[in-house]
Interface confidence: low
């Protein structure tokens, strides 16, 4: 009877310089003696070494040298006894591509290499970028706590540094940039704003980073209405707070452009002495059309804004003057093109 | 008088395209944004999206990205979907529309039918 | 997306009547919900704006109320020529949704 000597391993595996694998592995050898128990020991080979000899990648025998550049790096995981001969391998370089082999020994009978399944490593350039984690969405003055990891990159070899940047951490300690956990307090002004985590492995070359773009949630800020006059000069008139009175002669062209600061984008509308107008124009882009005027189309006009975060409003009487001349009088003004619907 | 008028009915193949026009007049061309909507037979109405015709900036549903394609030609103010692919379920009245004036008045198309058979 | 349910697929009424055409908004839509009228062969019309504002020319038996997620379109004394189907939409956020319709029969 032919003993029989078998190995499930894969054929190839790809790793990213800097991570981990762990490859599954089980063997069979034959074991008949019920009168002795000798040490099992199963060694990882690089191809074309000599078992005799050479140095191995990773063994269970204490007495075997291992290469000390896998030292620590190329361990076996699970139970020999139970013919598990799985490889882990960490903080994997590029000089580690290239095919191993397995090789068991116990007492004098059992001694096998098993050439024909040999295991393909090749370790290819670090694409593998760090995973931001947040709980979204971010709010404005309400600290929130972010971490960085790298998928793929295990306990085996070096610890991995981390560094932090973007806008939002100026007035951060250079220290607490440097965890792999941040608290950060988010402003309006950094909605938009890239944050990066850069992570490093100690002693190695090698650098990945990932940067996210920051969804700031914050409350309506800088509420105006802008009034542009349809008479081709884009004359401006910009309100700021309640009660201004704004003449304006009957016959007249206006829009009314109402502008808020918020994330997400507020609800805008607009009433006319407490009624809403335009549904589907104003609720998207706060703009409002008044054309032609007439003498009783004047009054209080309010844009309402609406948001998650809190809700403003801001009023201003239209006096509609009848027509008399063909000038405008506007006290406050400034140049601007005149805006069209959107 | 405010009009928008829309190109007549089609019937094609499945796996063609089909493009749709929409000419309006009786008011400023550029100043309202396009809507478009598309109503399958006996169906309720679904929106597919709308284009700025001042700038050509389109806002799409979801669902219609990759399917329909709203452009403009301002010098002819005609707004156009354009749409690819066609299965049998993209059978249907498809209507443009725009919101007018002080109080957002809808103009709507007379719809055109669009038939996917082979 | 937000989901306008018409529960109601189709009702029916007699001339001089008054009937209740309703419509819930899947999530808070305030008052930004219009209804439309469609008669058959024809494109939608315009009714109610703002939850119950109604546009100029729109005859006064029709009436829209509601905010937040439950609207009602009601038309008191029913006419002949109100048989059509009719339409919630809500214009809140993107995508501006519908609902499925409720069909209008006069007896």
């Known amino acids: 009877e032919k003993p029989v000597y078998e190995l499930q391993v894969q054929k190839s595996v790809t790793v990213q310089e800097g991570l981990c694998v762990l490859v599954p592995c089980s063997f069979s050898y034959p074991w008949r003696s019920w009168y002795s128990s000798p040490p099992l020991y199963v060694y990882w080979f690089r191809d074309g070494e000599i078992p005799y000899y050479a140095e191995v990648v990773a063994t269970n025998n204490p007495d075997r040298r291992v290469k000390p550049e896998t030292q620590g790096r190329f361990r076996l995981l699970g139970d020999v006894q139970k013919k598990n001969c799985s490889l882990s391998i960490g903080d994997a370089r590029m000089e580690d591509t290239g095919s191993y082999f397995f090789r068991v020994e116990r007492g004098r009978d059992v001694k096998y290499s098993y050439q024909q399944n040999k295991l393909n490593l090749e370790v290819t350039a670090l694409i593998e970028k760090p995973d931001i984690h947040f709980l979204e969405p971010l709010e404005s003055g309400r600290p929130t706590r972010l971490s960085c990891s790298l998928p793929g990159s295990c306990e085996a070899g070096p610890p991995l540094t981390f560094s932090w940047t973007g806008n939002a951490l100026s007035p951060l300690d250079p220290e607490t940039t440097r965890s792999s956990e941040l608290t950060l307090t988010p402003r309006p002004e950094d909605h938009g704003t890239n944050l990066t985590c850069q992570v490093k492995r100690q002693g190695a070359q090698v650098t990945t980073e990932r940067t996210v773009q920051l969804n700031v949630s914050y409350a309506p800020q800088n509420l105006a209405i802008s009034i542009f006059f349809r008479n081709g000069t884009g004359t401006a008139l910009r309100i700021l707070s309640n009660g201004m009175s704004v003449p304006i002669q009957e016959g007249q062209s206006l829009f009314l452009a109402c502008t808020v600061d918020s994330n997400p984008p507020a609800s805008l509308s607009w009433f006319r002495e407490g009624k809403a107008l335009n549904p589907s124009q104003t609720s998207m882009s706060g703009t409002l059309e008044l054309p032609n005027i007439g003498a009783r189309e004047g009054g209080e006009f309010t844009c309402r804004v609406q948001h998650p975060l809190g809700s403003q409003h801001l009023s201003f009487i239209l006096s509609v003057q009848r027509s008399s001349s063909s000038c405008i009088c506007v006290t406050e003004k400034q140049q601007g093109s005149w805006p069209l619907l959107t | 008088e405010i009009q928008l008028q829309q190109s007549g009915p089609e019937l094609v193949k499945p796996g063609a395209s089909v493009k749709v026009s929409c000419k309006a007049s009786?008011?400023?061309?550029?100043?309202?944004?396009m809507y478009w909507v598309k109503q399958s037979h006996g169906k309720s109405l679904e929106w597919i999206g709308y284009?700025?015709?001042?700038?050509?900036?389109?806002t799409y549903n979801q669902k219609f990205k990759g399917k329909a394609t709203l452009t403009v030609d301002k010098s002819s103010s005609t707004a156009f979907m354009h749409l690819n692919s066609l299965t049998s379920e993209d059978s249907a009245v498809f209507y443009c529309?725009?919101?007018?004036?002080?109080?957002?008045?809808?103009?709507w198309g007379q719809g055109t039918l669009v038939t996917v058979s082979a | 997306d937000i989901v306008m349910i018409q529960s109601q697929k189709f009702m029916s009424t007699s001339v001089g009547d008054r009937v209740s055409v309703t419509c819930k908004a899947s999530?808070?839509?305030?008052?930004?919900v219009a209804w439309y009228q469609q008669k058959p062969g024809q494109s939608p019309k315009a009714l109610i704006y703002s939850a119950s504002y109604r546009y100029s020319g729109v005859p006064d038996r029709f009436t829209g109320s509601g905010s937040g997620t439950d609207f009602t379109l009601t038309i008191s004394n029913v006419q002949s020529e109100d048989l059509a189907e009719y339409f919630c939409?809500?214009?809140?956020?993107?995508?501006?949704?519908f609902g499925s319709g409720t069909k209008l029969e006069i007896k």
């Open positions: 284009i700025d015709p001042y700038n050509g900036g389109t």
């Open positions: 939409q809500q214009y809140n956020s993107f995508p501006l949704t």
């Open positions: 999530q808070n839509v305030d008052t930004n």
């Open positions: 529309a725009f919101y007018y004036g002080y109080y957002g008045v809808p103009y």
């Open positions: 009786g008011y400023s061309f550029t100043d309202y944004n």
